[in-house]
Interface confidence: medium
């Protein structure tokens, strides 16, 4: 697994550097998770032809993956910092069950999958410190998550591969959109 942000050789070699600001830390954390997703996507795409599949829409209908929309306040038109931050945190919390599903889906990148999951938890903590309106953040129901996880794990092999591909792709896109929005804050 890659070295977590703030622990790379450059940072170790340069202790005189100014500490990262909250925004820089969040930025770096997201980019670190995105690197992990890239590695997982590589394994998924090498293992199956899911990345070129045109049947994505069929499987996507069964998943309720978080996605940014105009109303979330994260786009330049109608940008709203607090609404957007709530959306990002809520979305990441909703992704957690899908990241849990990914844990047993990789052979050579098992450690990487764990790193993505743990780094996302850290990112959520960073963002919660930044948010003013924590009451507006809805946490997914654990019972609902547990039954969703069971349902996903009971799918046939093809659907499981497709689900893995879709989760990684959607999570990458959600994070990229978040990165884009957070840089406006």
């Amino acid at each position: 697994a890659p070295v977590p942000p703030g622990e790379d050789s450059k940072d170790v070699a340069a202790p005189h550097r100014q500490p990262l600001t909250s925004s820089e830390r969040i930025d770096k954390q997201i980019r670190y998770i995105l690197d992990g997703i890239s590695a997982l996507r590589k394994e998924t795409c090498n293992k199956s032809n899911m990345c070129e599949s045109s049947k994505e829409a069929l499987a996507e209908n069964n998943l309720n993956l978080p996605k940014m929309a105009e109303k979330d306040g994260c786009f330049q038109s109608g940008f709203n910092e607090e609404t957007c931050l709530v959306k990002i945190i809520t979305g990441l919390l909703e992704f957690e069950v899908y990241l849990e599903y990914l844990q047993n889906r990789f052979e050579s990148s098992e450690e990487q999958a764990r790193a993505v999951q743990m780094s996302t938890k850290v990112l959520i903590q960073f963002l919660q410190k930044k948010a003013k309106n924590l009451d507006a953040i809805t946490t997914p129901d654990p019972t609902t998550n547990a039954s969703l996880l069971t349902k996903l794990q009971a799918q046939n092999q093809w659907l499981q591969d497709m689900t893995t591909h879709l989760i990684l792709r959607s999570f990458k896109e959600f994070l990229q959109s978040s990165l884009r929005a957070l840089r406006q804050m």
Epitope: E24, D27, R31, L34, D35, S38, K67, M68, A69, E70, C74, F75, Q76, S77, K172, E173, L175, Q176, S177, L179, R180, R183, Q184
Partner: antibody, heavy 121, light 107 residues
Framework: EVQLVQSGGGLIQPGGSLRLSCAAS????????MIWVRQAPGKGLEWVSD????????YYADSVKGRFTMSRDISKNTVYLQMNSLRAEDTGVYYC??????????????WGRGTLVTVSS | DIVMTQSPSTLSASVGDRVTITCRAS??????LAWYQQKPGRAPKVLIY???TLESGVPSRFSGSGSGTDFTLTISSLQPEDFATYYC?????????FGQGTKLEIK
């Protein structure tokens, strides 16, 4: 081969409208950041707008916000820049370009050849 | 908005010279910086991104360094085809901003 073919420039009167087109080949716009950059005669480069593939959200420079609209037609693999209420200061070469899909350190890796827009009475 | 200030505006040099162009950001941009080369009547092309990563196909005489607010582009030994205008660009947050350009001309 990855390339961007631009069309739609020309001479237009102040207050007029123009639509620039940028047809992509060798890659799909539905999974790439796309961007418009302009260059006034003898001047430097200025970012105009960009469109993020994921949700189709667009960002605009303050100088064109409310007047220009960037859009895409995925079936034609083409992006557009609709320019309304044109002003003399909008004169220049407009470049359509692609951001390298590198979340870590993005940069513009493919450029169109540019299309000249002249706003004059 | 981030403002990128390039210096010098114009630079006269000879083939074989080592030249350095600097770019300063009005606020820290980490390594979110790219350098572009533009020849008259042509579209720009990327030379360096991530402050110091050479784009594939770009000659190794081009190099970039810096992070935070201060960045440099160095051409170790000028070739005739290097006479052009160079732009730095901050790719950190919209609005994406370019420096005003440095015109490199033959002495």
């Amino acid at each position: 081969e990855v390339q961007l073919v631009q069309s739609g420039g020309g001479l237009i009167q102040p207050g007029g409208s123009l639509r620039l087109s940028c047809a992509a080949s060798g890659f799909t716009i539905s999974s790439n950041y796309m961007i418009w950059v302009r260059q006034a005669p003898g001047k430097g480069l200025e970012w105009v707008s960009d469109l993020y593939y994921y949700a189709g959200d667009t960002y605009y420079a303050d100088s064109v916000k409310g007047r220009f609209t960037m859009s895409r037609d995925i079936s034609k693999n083409t992006v557009y820049l609709q320019m309304n209420s044109l002003r003399a200061e909008d004169t220049g070469v407009y470049y359509c370009a692609r951001w390298a899909d590198d979340h870590n350190y993005p940069h513009i890796d493919v450029w169109g050849r540019g299309t000249l827009v002249t706003v004059s009475s | 908005d981030i403002v990128m200030t390039q210096s010098p505006s114009t630079l006269s040099a000879s083939v074989g010279d080592r030249v350095t162009i600097t770019c300063r950001a009005s606020q820290g941009i980490s390594s979110w910086l790219a350098w572009y080369q533009q020849k008259p009547g042509r579209a720009p092309k990327v030379l360096i991104y991530k402050a110091s990563t050479l784009e594939s196909g770009v000659p190794s005489r081009f190099s970039g360094s810096g992070s935070g607010t201060d960045f440099t582009l160095t051409i170790s030994s000028l070739q005739p085809e290097d006479f052009a205008t160079y732009y730095c660009a901050a790719h950190y947050a919209a609005p994406w901003t370019f420096g005003q350009g440095t015109k490199l001309e033959i002495k």
